[in-house]
């Protein structure tokens, strides 16, 4: 059950404060666990994580992962769980801490010979051994050798958006994920109405930039939903 | 700055109903999900139920079947119906308003509070 997940809610120390809001005006939700104690300005995180409703893991902190807090439990209910450590079971990498990541279900560190050549092989897998080109794009990628060691640059192989640069996120690029840039005003972004509709994206767009949400284009009000567009707007 | 003021608290008799109103508001105001939380005299804080935008719902064992949280989007609301109140009910109930921290580096996705409303049970 959740509260055997949460059994304590201590409250403990204190982070920088949230640099901004998600979402757009009037959207009623997101989830995680640090907090503003009421009557003050400073965050405070809180011991075994108050519960954070979310449907993926880019929802969630860069020490979160996304997923039902019980084992076989209720399946629409997914919370930011703590990530795990090395050594500790996974089944992707996105559950495993930063500097780790998920090999034959256990979390190993992201030690950069083993990880680019677990990368290597996880992508010749999903595409085949045939080494040509899709769209120009070669089907074999390799991490920087600096990987770990600086911030990956504009698409460099990632796991996790703290992988990447400042201005960066990690999203989907064919079956493998890179470091895309974060978007700005005016750009399109993609709004997903469904639960884990970002599994259809091949080419995920990374989301809006501090100060800005995804919402309808105000000239495209009136168009079908199937086809309105979205863009980067300020609150 | 987000502000969160939460109404609709106050003394009720065992087995009574309430309902909790939480009107967010602010220049810069957005969440992903909307809660609740509730601090008994002597406890610590504990999770009551949450809404995401989407509208999956999430309850703590102790209020499933009793309370419903709900949103209205476009007034920035959310609400907890609370029925078949009990004593152990009892306590400052407040709202909050969270974002993920991902996309802003942070380690854990966070919630803003309100100052709280007191809900009493008693006879």
């Known amino acids: 059950t959740l509260n055997s997940v949460l059994n304590s809610n201590a409250i403990k120390n204190l982070p920088p404060p949230l640099g901004g809001a998600a979402g757009h005006p009037g959207s009623a939700v997101s989830a995680a666990p640090g907090i503003l104690y009421p009557g003050g300005n400073k965050y405070q995180t809180i011991d075994n994580y108050q519960p954070y409703p979310c449907a993926e893991d880019e929802e969630c902190g860069t020490d979160e992962y996304c997923a039902s807090p019980t084992r076989g439990g209720d399946a629409g209910v997914q919370i930011c769980l703590a990530c795990r450590k090395r050594r500790k079971r996974c089944m992707r990498h996105a559950m495993c801490c930063p500097g780790n990541y998920c090999k034959n279900g256990i979390c190993v560190s992201s030690d950069q010979n083993h990880f680019r050549g677990e990368i290597e092989e996880t992508i010749t897998e999903s595409f085949g051994n045939d080494h040509s080109t899709l769209d120009g794009y070669s089907r074999r990628t390799t991490l920087s050798s600096k990987m770990y060691h600086t911030k990956g640059q504009e698409g460099s192989v990632c796991l996790r958006s703290s992988d990447c640069a400042s201005g960066l996120c990690c999203a989907r690029h064919f079956w493998s994920k890179i470091c895309k840039p974060v978007l700005k005003e005016g750009q399109v972004c993609t709004k997903h109405r469904r639960k884990g509709s970002h599994g259809l994206e091949i080419f995920q767009r990374c989301y809006c930039g501090e100060g800005l949400s995804c919402r309808i284009q105000k000239d495209h009000h009136q168009a079908s939903n199937s086809s309105r567009l979205h863009t980067c707007q300020r609150h | 700055e987000v502000q969160l003021v939460e109404s609709g608290g106050g003394l009720v008799q065992p087995g009574g109903s309430l309902r909790l109103s939480c009107a967010a508001s602010g220049r810069r105001f957005s969440a992903d999900v909307m809660g609740w939380f509730r601090q008994a005299p002597g406890k610590e804080r504990e999770f009551v139920a949450a809404?995401?935008?989407?509208?999956?719902?999430l309850y703590a064992d102790s209020v499933k079947g009793r309370f419903t949280i709900s949103a209205d989007n476009s007034k920035n609301t959310a609400y907890l119906q609370m029925n078949s109140l009990k004593p152990e009910d009892t306590a400052v109930y407040y709202c909050?308003?969270?974002?993920?921290?991902?996309?802003?580096?942070?380690?854990?996705?966070?919630?803003?509070w309100g100052q709280g409303t007191l809900v009493t049970v008693s006879s």
């Open positions: 809404i995401r935008s989407g509208g999956t719902t």
């Open positions: 909050a308003a969270g974002n993920g921290g991902r996309q802003y580096g942070h380690s854990r996705a966070r919630y803003d």
